[in-house]
Interface confidence: low
Amino acid sequence: SGVFQLQLQEFINERGVLASGRPCEPGCRTFFRVCLKHFQAVVSPGPCTFGTVSTPVLGTNSFAVRDDSSGGGRNPLQLPFNFTWPGTFSLIIEAWHAPGDDLRPEALPPDALISKIAIQGSLAVGQNWLLDEQTSTLTRLRYSYRVICSDNYYGDNCSRLCKKRNDHFGHYVCQPDGNLSCLPGWTGEYCQQPICLSGCHEQNGYCSKPAECLCRPGWQGRLCNECIPHNGCRHGTCSTPWQCTCDEGWGGLFCDQDLNYCTHHSPCKNGATCSNSGQRSYTCTCRPGYTGVDCELELSECDSNPCRNGGSCKDQEDGYHCLCPPGYYGLHCEHSTLSCADSPCFNGGSCRERNQGANYACECPPNFTGSNCEKKVDRCTSNPCANGGQCLNRGPSRMCRCRPGFTGTYCELHVSDCARNPCAHGGTCHDLENGLMCTCPAGFSGRRCEVRTSIDACASSPCFNRATCYTDLSTDTFVCNCPYGFVGSRCEFPVGLPPSFPW
């Protein structure tokens, strides 16, 4: 698809005459008819196979034609075609005189023709105009012409369709030959493939538009070169997707178990010493005057219940003071002014006189205590649970709820670190509050008895009677050098009379 363009430039008819030689009255009001057709060796009448076009009246007798004539005419004249341009053509240009306003062929007398030119030849598609001038005895016509392709058609014959686009289906403009030229950021045959962000990982990244880098599952980062750790990985990293390699001090599948609670959380208060004792487990060793799991409680001197016989304790800056009930006196209300005759024992307690009746003692039934059996036994008062265990009263009995890492009736036992037999070469394992210790047999040393050492055979003092012991390093054995008066491998026999032999 293309357009044959004809630009009329100048028409000369100095005498103002028709082709017949008759003059126009008052002058030749000139318009043109153009016929474009297939190539003919001899241009002959017949259908204008490539198209026709007419102009309005452009001037009288001699005139120059403006680039775009007013009055509805167009210059250059357009003759569009909807086929492959063959490269050859025939062109007929007729100049006519219009006596009136009706320019239709049937409305004009046959002798209204002023001149007629016919040319034929080759014409390639291109932007350049071909200038031509045709002269007859009475007239001269100067014009130029060319063939150009319609919008979106390209190539030597205007046969190549290419429509620039910028959407899902392509991102390109068209080159003069009709080939696609991708817009920046796009590639591929139809420029549908975006060029990803520079450096975007070839395997782990992709893109749906230019300069983008979208990550495939398991990868992240601007260039999709960082792996994504296991979902839920709290304190860990990865070297390949979905891994969770724990940072120092953390453990568990999601690296969310704190193996160094003391450092990460500093749970112990009031200057206490913190010891890790397993995952999320710790022990606080309190400074004097403090108590509680985290040493968060200040000890009161009255907490130890120093006042006897129902005396009430009052804290003072420099200690405490006991307020004694009637019948008692002393620093701790330990002295009584009562005797068994006063029935001082409560809750079924039996009274026993002491010091010839000047004093007494109560023997309390189960579940009661105190000098006068006045107190119900609280089995947790004495804080029987060790290692921060929680004491729970259970009717007549009690139980300890142990913190992680401890066990036993009173939480007195560490959950044994020795259970997995960590000591090598027959070493003896000892559970400590913060870990374990190996006692190694002779010939071994190191934290786990893993280091072999030479045996000092004299270490066990095998020589008697102040003999000197020497170690033979080559055989790991000892030699005793006996003092005067002793013999034997260990200098164990005193020298006496010669032994009496039985022969």
Partner: antibody
Framework: EVQLVQSGAEVKKPGASVKVSCKAS????????INWVRQATGQGLEWLGW????????GYAQKFQGRVTMTRNTSISTADMELSSLTSDDTAVYYC??????????????????WGQGTTVTVSS | QPVLTQPASVSGSPGQSITISCTGT?????????VSWFQQHPGKAPKLMIY???NRPSGVSNRFSGSKSGNTASLTISGLQAEDGADYYC??????????FGTGTKVTVL
């Protein structure tokens, strides 16, 4: 001027179907997507689906799958949205919106940049 | 059908800045840079204000800006003006090749 002009208001009975049309002008109809969005009185926007006028491909919201059909007629640059098995919950203003790809410094972006005036669909017995 | 969560209302005095949030999931807001913001005045069709997280169509004031962090996108209106009073909706592309809108935020200029 790029414009989307929608068909007029519709009143339908429960169980019936409604077809809303959207005529595009001022741009190449097949170059951009058409989205359909609805809004019940006093409520927010709810996306129904998209259609590619060039290929006819569609993408529907899961909620409307099996009940909505989006079609087009490229010769007259018109997109249609048909919703079947109507209930009173489908009473809303239905909008078509062009899904346009922008270009900026070699990058390409998507936005629902031009909207129709809206079509009121009332479902009542 | 999932929706993106927005605050029901936000207000500010003329000249102030306000920010509207839009929270989704890694399958929509967090997974793509395809977040748009729309302004809607009563009785009118929505108007595109921001596309692809932080891009403004021509004709939209540079007082409107967008951003995104993780699964949350934000629209900021600076130098608030009376005509900014309207409903605002966010929208995002999702991993199932669909779009989803936010619950909407009413902006009141005091």
């Amino acid at each position: 001027e790029v414009q989307l002009v929608q068909s007029g208001a519709e009143v339908k009975k429960p169980g019936a179907s409604v077809k809303v049309s959207c005529k595009a002008s001022g741009y190449t109809f097949t170059s951009d997507e058409i989205n359909w969005v609805r809004q019940a009185t006093g409520q927010g926007l709810e996306w129904l689906g998209w259609m590619n006028p060039h290929s006819g491909n569609t993408g529907y919201a899961q909620k409307f799958q099996g009940r909505v059909t989006m079609t087009r007629n490229t010769s007259i640059s018109t997109a249609d949205m048909e919703l079947s098995s109507l209930t009173s919950d489908d009473t809303a203003v239905y909008y078509c919106a062009r899904g346009h790809y922008y270009e900026s410094s070699g990058y390409f972006f998507y936005g629902m940049d031009v909207w129709g005036q809206g079509t009121t669909v009332t479902v009542s017995s | 059908q999932p929706v993106l969560t927005q605050p029901a209302s936000v207000s500010g005095s003329p000249g102030q800045s306000i920010t509207i949030s839009c929270t989704g999931t890694s399958s929509d807001v967090g997974g793509y840079n395809y977040v748009s913001w729309f302004q809607q005045h009563p009785g009118k069709a929505p108007k595109l204000m921001i596309y692809d997280v932080n891009n403004r169509p021509s004709g939209v004031s540079n007082r409107f800006s967008g951003s995104k962090s993780g699964n949350t996108a934000s629209l900021t209106i600076s130098g608030l003006q009376a005509e900014d009073g309207a409903d605002y909706y966010c929208s995002s592309y999702t991993s199932s090749s669909t779009y989803v809108f936010g619950t909407g935020t009413k902006v009141t200029v005091l």
